[in-house]
């Protein structure tokens, strides 16, 4: 496609889906797109959604059960059943002291771990905020399908320099048909120049990534 067609031009019967690449943004902006008709009915969609939710729920339940099992196993290794049979009063007192000491030690460890967790949570929150701040600085525009002429698009992009580029285009249109190859190459170079002028190179890179 030439890319200079205006709104009155008759649409093609079945256009091939155009990939959203910045290298053909002009074509994307001007080509009419036939709306892709969904092959799945609404009820089927709902059914599938429900099924996916059920699967997700089952997965979550399974994970929770696994965590419970893991906790149980951990506790069974750490907390053996009390073996008091045959122990005298002296041993029971000693055992109480031992258990109290163990509780104190575990409490200390728990306190240390909680402090580490709190520190990590704070760090994560800070980093998340930084990410949001950076995203705010380099916000990507949401691309919408618009039917716009190339001239209008150039006007919007270049403002005052638009006239100069339009003259260039008018000149390019006058080139003989046998020079098509040359024309394509020149158009490519010209696009590069415009990109450099308008700072589109950066946007292209962002869009492609």
């Amino acid at each position: 496609a030439d890319g200079s067609s205006d709104a009155a031009r008759e649409p093609r019967p079945a256009p091939a889906p155009i990939r959203r690449r910045s290298s053909n943004y002009r074509a994307y902006a001007t080509e009419p797109h036939a709306k892709k008709k969904s092959k799945i009915s609404a009820s089927r969609k709902l059914q599938l959604k429900t099924l996916l939710l059920q699967i997700a729920k089952q997965e979550l339940e399974r994970e929770a059960e696994e965590r419970r099992g893991e906790k149980g196993r951990a506790l069974s290794t750490r907390c053996q059943p009390l073996e008091l049979a045959g122990l005298g009063f002296a041993e029971l007192q000693d055992l109480c002291r031992q258990l109290h000491a163990r509780v104190d030690k575990v409490d200390e460890e728990r306190y240390d771990i909680e402090a580490k967790v709190t520190k990590n949570i704070t760090e994560i929150a800070d980093l998340t905020q930084k990410i949001f701040d950076l995203r705010g600085k380099f916000k990507r525009p949401t691309l919408r399908r618009v039917r716009i002429s190339a001239d209008a698009m150039m006007q919007a992009l270049l403002g005052a320099r638009a006239k100069e580029s339009l003259d260039l285009r008018a000149h390019l249109k006058q080139v003989k048909k046998e020079d098509t190859e040359k024309e394509n190459r020149e158009v490519g170079d010209w696009r590069k120049n415009i990109d450099a002028l308008s700072g589109m190179e950066g946007r292209k890179k962002k869009f492609e990534s």
């Epitope: 053996q80 059943p81 073996e83 008091l84 049979a85 045959g86 122990l87 005298g88 009063f89 002296a90 041993e91 007192q93 000693d94 055992l95 031992q98």
Partner: antibody, heavy 120, light 113 residues
Framework: EVKLEESGGGLVKPGGTLKLSCAAS????????MSWVRQTPEKRLDWVAT????????FYPDSVKGRFTISRDNARNTLYLQMNSLRSEDTAMYYC?????????????WGQGTLVTVSA | DIVMTQSPSSLAMSVGQKVTMSCKSS????????????LAWYQQKPGQSPKLLVY???TRESGVPRRFRGRGRGTRFTLTISSVQAEDLADYFC?????????FGAGTKLELK
Amino acid sequence: EVKLEESGGGLVKPGGTLKLSCAASGFTFSSYAMSWVRQTPEKRLDWVATISSGGSYIFYPDSVKGRFTISRDNARNTLYLQMNSLRSEDTAMYYCARHHNPDKSGFAYWGQGTLVTVSA
Amino acid sequence: DIVMTQSPSSLAMSVGQKVTMSCKSSQSLLNSSNQKNYLAWYQQKPGQSPKLLVYFASTRESGVPRRFRGRGRGTRFTLTISSVQAEDLADYFCQQHYSTPLTFGAGTKLELK
């Protein structure tokens, strides 16, 4: 009839190691706490170690802590005492003793003992 | 640690005589929750291992003759043999089972005149 039989004693040099065993019979070994008690040549009795019925809880006096290790094998009805870094003051007759029933107190049964001599 | 002090270290008695030996602990062996004193008495005959005679200061172990009687509470305890027999020739030890480390008295040697 409750029977406790110690073995593994002998002559050992200071700093040496020795492992004592006590074979138990005539009672449900896994239901009772067990201890090692020693008697010095001067006839003084010293408590050495105690282990709970399942082996989870262990008690030592400071004099042997870090050097002696009490353990048990309930499947084999056997009590052990691993003695490391032996000193001359560890020379004694070592007895294996079964604790009384939970509602009672003291060492209800004693073995015949095994003699440990620590000498250069 | 609880220190157990026995006295006398030895006594010589004739058969049929009444004998009393003493045992003192450096701290109370009374468990206030069950009102029991955690003290035991053992008899050790020559060439044999110790044998439990009395526990909880005054409860006679099964099979122990009635002539052996333990008394006392808190820190002062006694073992009395109402009528000494020849087979009672032995060393007698008291032991506290109140707190670890478990400790024994040095013993009282009973000899016959």
